[in-house]
């Protein structure tokens, strides 16, 4: 009776179970009643990352420096190349096919999370008591100056974009 299902790392063809090719190898010919599956290693700069019955290996990704890409992990016969972005840039997608500059947080916003090669800057509005007067990809919201600790009084209230202005206490009562 021919099998209807095969074991792990096997596949069903012509009513029989053949061994899959191991990662890093492609299928040349299916097994027969008398012969084993024939597999061949992937060529240099190609890969297959699973047990498979593929007749062609996949090409390694190219981390094109002209697109701001650099290699994070070199490709092998079993794994694809992993790209990341040069400093100051981050990937436009999960597959990291190109890079764009990190965005800056505008005045009134501070950096919540600094960008990496794979993620952009995350900004947050400065809450009451904090401000940012610069456009920056690194600076967090800074606390308003405490006039009291300097024995001064607030002459001008702070905003999310400006610090408070301190001045001397009015001694005339």
């Amino acid at each position: 009776e021919p099998p209807t299902a095969c074991r792990e790392k096997q596949y069903l063809i012509n009513s029989q179970c053949c061994s899959l090719c191991q990662p890093g190898q492609k299928l040349v010919s299916d097994c027969t009643e008398f012969t084993e599956t024939e597999c061949l290693p992937c060529s240099e700069s190609e890969f297959l990352d699973t047990w498979n019955r593929e007749t062609r290996c996949h090409q390694h990704k190219y981390c094109d420096p002209n697109l701001g890409l650099q290699v994070q992990q070199k490709g092998t016969s079993e794994t694809d190349t992993i790209c990341t972005c040069e400093e100051g840039l981050h990937c436009t997608s999960e597959s990291c096919e190109s890079c764009v500059p990190h965005r800056s947080c505008l005045p009134g916003f501070g950096v919540k999370q600094i960008a990496t090669g794979v993620s952009d800057t995350i900004c947050e509005p400065c809450p009451v008591g904090f401000f940012s007067n610069v456009s920056s990809a690194f600076e967090k919201c800074r606390p308003w100056t405490s006039c009291e600790t300097k024995d001064l009084v607030v002459q001008q209230a702070g905003t999310n974009k400006t610090d408070v202005v301190c001045g001397p206490q009015d001694r005339q009562r």
Epitope: S43, E44, S45, H60, C63, Q73, T79
Partner: antibody, heavy 119, light 113 residues
Amino acid sequence: EVQLVESGGGLVKPGGSLRLSCAASGFTFSDYGMHWVRQAPGKGLEWVAYISSGNRIIYYADTVKGRFTISRDNAKNSLYLQMNSLRAEDTAVYYCARQDGYRYAMDYWGQGTLVTVSS
Amino acid sequence: DIVMTQSPDSLAVSLGEKVTINCKSSQSLLNSGNQKNYLTWHQQKPGQPPKLLIYWTSTRESGVPDRFSGSGSGTDFTLTISSLQAEDVAVYYCQNDYTYPLTFGGGTKVEIK
């Protein structure tokens, strides 16, 4: 027997150009990635550039980017390194080395060719 | 770039004695897809080009005597010569084969005492 033979080295003035060649024999050249690696006199090894078996992928060290160009001619079993805007610090023995598709390591090296940049 | 730091810079050992060379990488050389550490060792004898000795941290290249062995993972690696022979006098280099730019350690010169 695998053989890699470099040529084209010599004395060149700063700012000058030189083209190195690496003739491969004893294996199917078009199946292998190729590297250039250099070694300054009395110093260690420094990777220079890589080109994949099918010419599709090329990477350079930052120290040579924009000045050096790696290329290959699979029909002629040859690897090349075009070196422009040469500097004194490029003085070294230049080796070609092959990379196979299994180990992904430099498994054979040539004997090297000496490049001297001096006025 | 990954920085490869070798120690010692040089050592002199008696014939038949054990040699241990250390190599430290500034970041992990573990390929997450196949779980292999892409650390390579090359041997360079005086006046000769380098020769592949060990790849994937511990796999000896064909024809390399079994007195040579490699170990380690992540960022810390070791090359051991179990019993030094006269023909082992050379400079040994560890190499990052994990990512570009490929980088080498500064080399360890092994001499006979």
